[in-house]
Interface confidence: medium
């Protein structure tokens, strides 16, 4: 279930897990179904807030992902203390009307009070029924 991602911050992310996805194999996002994501990262700052930002590039067109709860503190115990590891489990209900694509790049960023807490890019996602 551990997937390969590109770090887009300072290697705060220790691992990313997606049920049914492995390594650098294609990771299928099914339309109209929940998509589960778990990430373990080390806090690079003391922060009492943590905000999730998810963007997707679908066939080269960048879009904001709808239906995202931006408050990361709903999914892990805040406040975060610098140097401690945190486990965030997040479920996104994929819209039924999401476009099908074989070329999806997803960027997940977690922002703290003092900037980026963690950032990961998944380059091998696909949206299918």
């Amino acid at each position: 279930d551990q997937v390969d991602v590109k770090d887009c911050a300072n290697h705060e992310i220790k691992k990313v897990l997606v049920p049914g996805c492995h390594g650098s194999e294609p990771c299928i996002i099914h339309r109209g179904k929940p998509f589960q994501l778990e990430a373990v990262f080390e806090a690079n700052q003391n922060t009492k807030t943590a905000k999730i930002e998810i963007k997707a590039s679908i066939d080269g067109l960048e879009v904001d992902v709808p239906g995202i709860d931006p408050n990361a503190c709903h999914y892990m115990k805040c406040p975060l203390v610098k140097g401690q590891q945190y486990d965030i489990k997040y479920t996104w209900n994929v819209p039924k009307i999401a476009p099908k694509s074989e070329n999806v790049v997803v960027t997940v960023k977690v922002m703290g009070d003092d900037g980026v807490l963690a950032c990961a890019i998944a380059t091998h996602a696909k949206i299918r029924d």
Epitope: N46, K48, T49, A50, D69, N71, C73, H74, Y75, M76, K77, C78, P79, L80, V81, Y90, T91
Partner: antibody, heavy 121, light 113 residues
Framework: QVQLQQSGPELVKPGASVKISCKAP????????MNWVKQRPGKGLEWVGR????????NYNGKFMGKATLTADKSSNTAYIQLSSLTSEDSAVYFC??????????????WGTGTTVTVSS | DIVMTQSPSSLALSVGQKVTMNCRSS????????????LAWFQQKPGQSPRLLIY???TRESGVPDRFIGSGSGTDFTLTISSVQAEDLADYFC?????????FGAGTTLELK
């Protein structure tokens, strides 16, 4: 189990003010909310408000606005509640309690020892 | 404000019996994004500070015996003690951690026969 250490009982006259302290162990003090809870016999528990010692941010229960003032001293890991214009209705046990900072992690996982305030002439 | 209503106000049981107490909120405590219910249960023994037993309606705090079981969703919640022990003599309070002002139920007193 870890407990927050509170100051001793207070006997105060009506109209006076009182300040209670709550000392937390360790360095996580600045990164938790410190809450105050009032308990009167037969009246259950009432949330007074909370302070985030890291930056002094406060939230109050509207019922206690003007009655309670919350402060904190990061250097000594101590939170304070000051109660003013005291009446018999303010006679109660006051607890401090720690909660997480996340928007909805507002349950109290560590409690203080409690301070009894008695308002009497 | 969210009003929390507990029932019954008191219970008298014998050691080994199963006990169930209820807590109802005036509005739903379910977060639809993560399907968590923002309800906590506390135990307070005479002359002591409250102690956290359960949060997110059913997650047991570390060190809490597994005879304490939290359940329920939305507006209706239950704390069950599967086999009451003498040391469980206490008041039990529910608290919503969904919105400020944070509010508590009036409590259920557990007495032993």
């Amino acid at each position: 189990q870890v407990q927050l250490q509170q100051s001793g009982p207070e006997l105060v006259k009506p109209g006076a003010s009182v300040k209670i302290s709550c000392k937390a162990p360790g360095n996580a003090f600045s990164y938790s909310w410190m809450n105050w809870v009032k308990q009167r016999p037969g009246k259950g528990l009432e949330w007074v408000g909370r302070i985030y010692p890291g930056d002094g941010d406060t939230n109050y229960n509207g019922k206690f606005m003007g009655k309670a003032t919350l402060t904190a001293d990061k250097s000594s890991n101590t939170a304070y509640i000051q109660l003013s214009s005291l009446t018999s209705e303010d006679s109660a046990v006051y607890f401090c309690a720690r909660s997480g900072g996340g928007t909805l992690y507002w349950y109290f996982d560590v409690w203080g020892t409690g301070t009894t305030v008695t308002v009497s002439s | 404000d969210i009003v929390m209503t507990q029932s019954p106000s008191s219970l008298a049981l014998s050691v080994g019996q199963k006990v169930t107490m209820n807590c109802r909120s005036s509005q739903s405590l379910l977060n639809s994004f993560n399907q968590k219910n923002y309800l906590a249960w506390f135990q307070q023994k005479p002359g002591q500070s409250p102690r956290l037993l359960i949060y997110f309606a059913s997650t047991r705090e570390s060190g809490v015996p597994d005879r304490f079981i939290g359940s329920g969703s939305g507006t209706d919640f239950t704390l069950t003690i599967s086999s009451v022990q003498a040391e469980d003599l206490a008041d039990y309070f529910c608290q919503q951690h969904y919105n400020t002002p944070l509010t508590f139920g009036a409590g259920t007193t557990l007495e032993l026969k």
